[in-house]
Structures are given as structure tokens and as C-alpha cells.
């Protein structure tokens, strides 16, 4: 009989398609912050705005104390743009005096922290020179890629120098992730 070719033991079970609107996602935007003390070989992490303006967290994706918390395991697209700004005079001072306190490059790192693993994992890193550009310079660094994440993972964005981050507009510096 025709119906017998799809007997229960051979039936494929399809999970119902999940609406995109139900998936965890967040878009965080730049927020003003005062530079804090950090360890010499460790870049400081940025705080983010999570609810005002363009920022939001949805569907159990939460933001707390610099971290974006991953609520369920899966493949996520993670992205961040950080816009830096400064003045070239800082660069000439570096060259002339070898001043260690002003950078000749800027770096952004998206880092994953997993409670079960002792060391943070660098997921993405971007670096640019800042001493080759005009008098008042602006340099955005954009990072984005897909990663397999586990429930409970935490994401943060580290930068080489918080004092150079442009916090003036929420569309210049941002950080987000969404479940694919």
C-alpha cells in the first residue's frame, strides 16, 4: 500500500523551523567610561550601552558588566566596530621621545570567556597603525565572523587604549552577536 512506504520507523522527524525573532541577539553601542587600571599585558575591556538608543538585548541574550552572555549553544555571528581617534602630534612625540604612553598602533580584540576554561580565548583581532594618517585622525576597526559558542560563554571587546575610543556617536562604535 502506498502509505506503507512512510511507516513510523522510517519517518524523518523535522524540528519545526524557528522564527528568527525568537533567536538570541544583541546590539550594544558605545558608552562613555573612565579609563581604569589594568594589567600591563592585558588590554582593558569596554563597557557597552545595552538599552538606550540603538542598543538592545533580546531573547535571553543578556549584557552584564562588560560581558555579553550566551544563553544557548549554537553558531553565532559576532561583530564589533571600534572607532579610534587622536592627533598626529602624539605620533611625532612618540618618535622623538620614544614615549611609551602613547600608542603608534590601535588594537581591538573580541574575547571569549568560558567558565570551564582558565584562559580567555581571542576570537578576533584587528590592528592598525595610527602614525601614518592626517593631523586629527579617525580609524575604525571592524571585526566579524561566525563561531560555535556554548551556553554560558561570555563575550567581551578589549582595546589597546580606552582613551582613544570615539564615544561620540552610537553608530561609530558597537558590538553585537546573533544566533544563526
Amino acid at each position: 500500500l502506498k502509505g506503507q512506504e512512510f511507516a513510523p520507523s522510517h519517518q524523518q522527524v523535522y524540528a519545526p523551523l524557528r522564527a528568527d525573532g525568537d533567536k538570541p541577539r544583541a546590539h550594544l553601542t558605545v558608552v562613555r567610561q573612565t579609563p581604569t587600571q589594568h594589567f600591563k599585558n592585558q588590554f582593558p575591556a569596554l563597557h557597552w550601552e545595552h538599552e538606550l538608543g540603538l542598543a538592545f538585548t533580546k531573547n535571553r541574550m543578556n549584557y552584564t558588566n562588560k560581558f555579553l552572555l550566551i544563553p544557548e549553544s549554537g553558531d553565532y555571528f559576532i561583530y564589533s566596530q571600534v572607532t579610534f581617534r587622536g592627533m598626529t602630534s602624539e605620533c611625532s612625540e612618540i618618535r622623538q621621545a620614544g614615549r611609551p604612553n602613547k600608542p603608534d598602533s590601535i588594537t581591538v580584540v573580541i574575547t571569549k570567556v568560558t567558565d570551564s576554561y582558565p584562559e580567555p580565548t581571542q576570537l578576533l583581532m584587528g590592528t592598525k597603525s595610527v602614525c601614518e594618517v592626517g593631523s586629527n585622525w579617525f580609524q575604525p576597526i571592524y571585526l566579524g565572523a561566525m563561531f560555535s559558542l556554548q551556553e554560558g560563554d561570555k563575550l567581551m571587546v578589549n582595546v589597546s587604549d580606552i582613551s582613544l575610543v570615539d564615544y561620540t556617536k552610537e553608530d561609530k562604535t558597537f558590538f553585537g552577536a546573533f544566533l544563526l
Partner: antibody, heavy 124, light 107 residues
Framework: QVQLVQSGAEVKKPGASVKVSCKVS????????VHWVRQAPGQGLEWMGV???????DYNSKFQGRVTMTRDTSTNTVYMELSSLRSEDTAVYYC??????????????????WGQGTLVTVSS | DIQMTQSPSSVSASVGDRVTITCRAS??????LAWYQQKPGKSPKLLIY???SLQDGVPSRFSGSGSGTDYTLTISSLQPEDFATYFC?????????FGQGTKLEIK
């Protein structure tokens, strides 16, 4: 760019009410918090209350029961109404958009953007 | 409510002078302090947040310091446009109290 434009000066009699408007541009009142601060002539600044982006309000207990803050999302305007006016309510009333900032792991509020102010004079 | 006490209430100084204004909170505000400048007939302008961070566009002659309950605003070399009234404000909890102001006048 961010702008907050307030309604014009008002003269009111004691016991009356006044309603001051604050029309904003460059942002949405459903996305940012709008506060009201007043300043009596030659005096300091006094926080009155806030219309939170989600539509809730918080008032300074000093004005509780006399102040009402509302908004019209279709015109991106926030209103502050103060009732039972007395002479000591004579002041310039400002609306201001709050900003969040972090120090270490704590966040705080300040006021980077202000309206031009509305003078309310209460006199018999 | 947190009380904010500013001193002095007024100060006279000349162009080029270094001026310091202090603000004391009635309890620890953990550096959650902002400073504003206000000129007659104008709205306040944010100068400093987080006790020591300069708001965008504010000249570097303005600086802030302090922690706990005691905070300071310093203008390193007064310019003619700096003569105004200055207010501190705590941003920790409502009612987000302001200091009573310090009027900076030309000597």
C-alpha cells in the same frame, strides 16, 4: 544632531497649573530618558523627575503629587505639568537628555544635552 | 538624598590664573560626579563626567579629580570665556543632586 526645544515663557497665578513641552529631534523619546531640572532665579539646579525611555516616570519626592510627566511619541515630545503653583515655583524649567557613563563597573547618569529653558513666573 | 556642598560660593580671579572649586558629597559617590558650566541666560554645559573625564569638545585646561566624597574642578589658566557659574552633580542615585554653584568672577 540632538536638540531639545522647549515651549515659551509662562505667567501663572498661584494655585494654577503649568504645562511645559520639550520637543526633541536627533533621537527618539522611546529610546532615551528625558529629565526635568529647574532653577529658581539666582539659585542652583534642582532635579524634578524623569520620563524613562520605556514610558515610566520617577519624580523627586519634593514634587510628588504636584508634578506629572507625560509624552507624545508621535511628535517626539515630552511634557512636564506642575500643579498648585506657588511663588517659589518661579524658575527656569529645563528638559535634558540623560547620558550613562561607567566608572569601574558602576554606571551613573549625567546631562550632556539640555533644552533652552522655559521661564515660569508665578505671581498674583 | 545625597547632599552636595560646593565651595567657595564665589571666587574672583584674573585671566591666566589657576582656579580650584571643590565639591563634597554627604556620602561616597564612587567617582560618579559631573561638573557643569553655566553662563547667564544659558543652559548648563557638561564639562566633566566620572570625576575626571573630559566631555568631548571641552578644552584641556579644565580638569577634575577626586574620589569618595571629595572632588575638585581645576581650571589651569583662566580664559575670558571661563567666567561663569560652575555646578557639580552626583549621578549615583535620584534625585541626582546638584551643588549650589560657584560663581567665578573677574577680579
Amino acid at each position: 544632531q540632538v536638540q531639545l526645544v522647549q515651549s515659551g515663557a509662562e505667567v501663572k497665578k498661584p494655585g494654577a497649573s503649568v504645562k511645559v513641552s520639550c520637543k526633541v529631534s536627533g533621537f527618539s523619546v522611546t529610546s532615551y530618558n528625558v529629565h526635568w531640572v529647574r532653577q529658581a532665579p539666582g539659585q542652583g539646579l534642582e532635579w524634578m523627575g524623569v520620563m524613562w525611555y520605556g514610558g515610566n516616570t520617577d519624580y523627586n519626592s519634593k514634587f510628588q503629587g504636584r508634578v506629572t510627566m507625560t509624552r507624545d511619541t508621535s511628535t517626539n515630545t515630552v511634557y512636564m505639568e506642575l500643579s498648585s503653583l506657588r511663588s517659589e515655583d518661579t524658575a527656569v524649567y529645563y528638559c535634558a537628555r540623560a547620558g550613562r557613563y561607567y566608572v569601574d563597573s558602576n554606571y551613573y547618569w549625567d546631562f550632556p544635552y539640555w533644552g533652552q529653558g522655559t521661564l515660569v513666573t508665578v505671581s498674583s | 538624598d545625597i547632599q552636595m556642598t560646593q565651595s567657595p560660593s564665589s571666587v574672583s580671579a584674573s585671566v591666566g590664573d589657576r582656579v580650584t572649586i571643590t565639591c563634597r558629597a554627604s556620602e561616597d559617590i564612587y567617582s560618579g560626579l559631573a561638573w557643569y558650566q553655566q553662563k547667564p541666560g544659558k543652559s548648563p554645559k557638561l564639562l566633566i563626567y566620572g570625576a575626571s573625564s573630559l566631555q568631548d569638545g571641552v578644552p584641556s585646561r579644565f580638569s577634575g579629580s577626586g574620589s569618595g566624597t571629595d572632588y575638585t574642578l581645576t581650571i589651569s589658566s583662566l580664559q575670558p570665556e571661563d567666567f561663569a557659574t560652575y555646578f557639580c552633580q552626583e549621578g549615583l542615585k535620584s534625585p541626582y543632586t546638584f551643588g549650589q554653584g560657584t560663581k567665578l568672577e573677574i577680579k
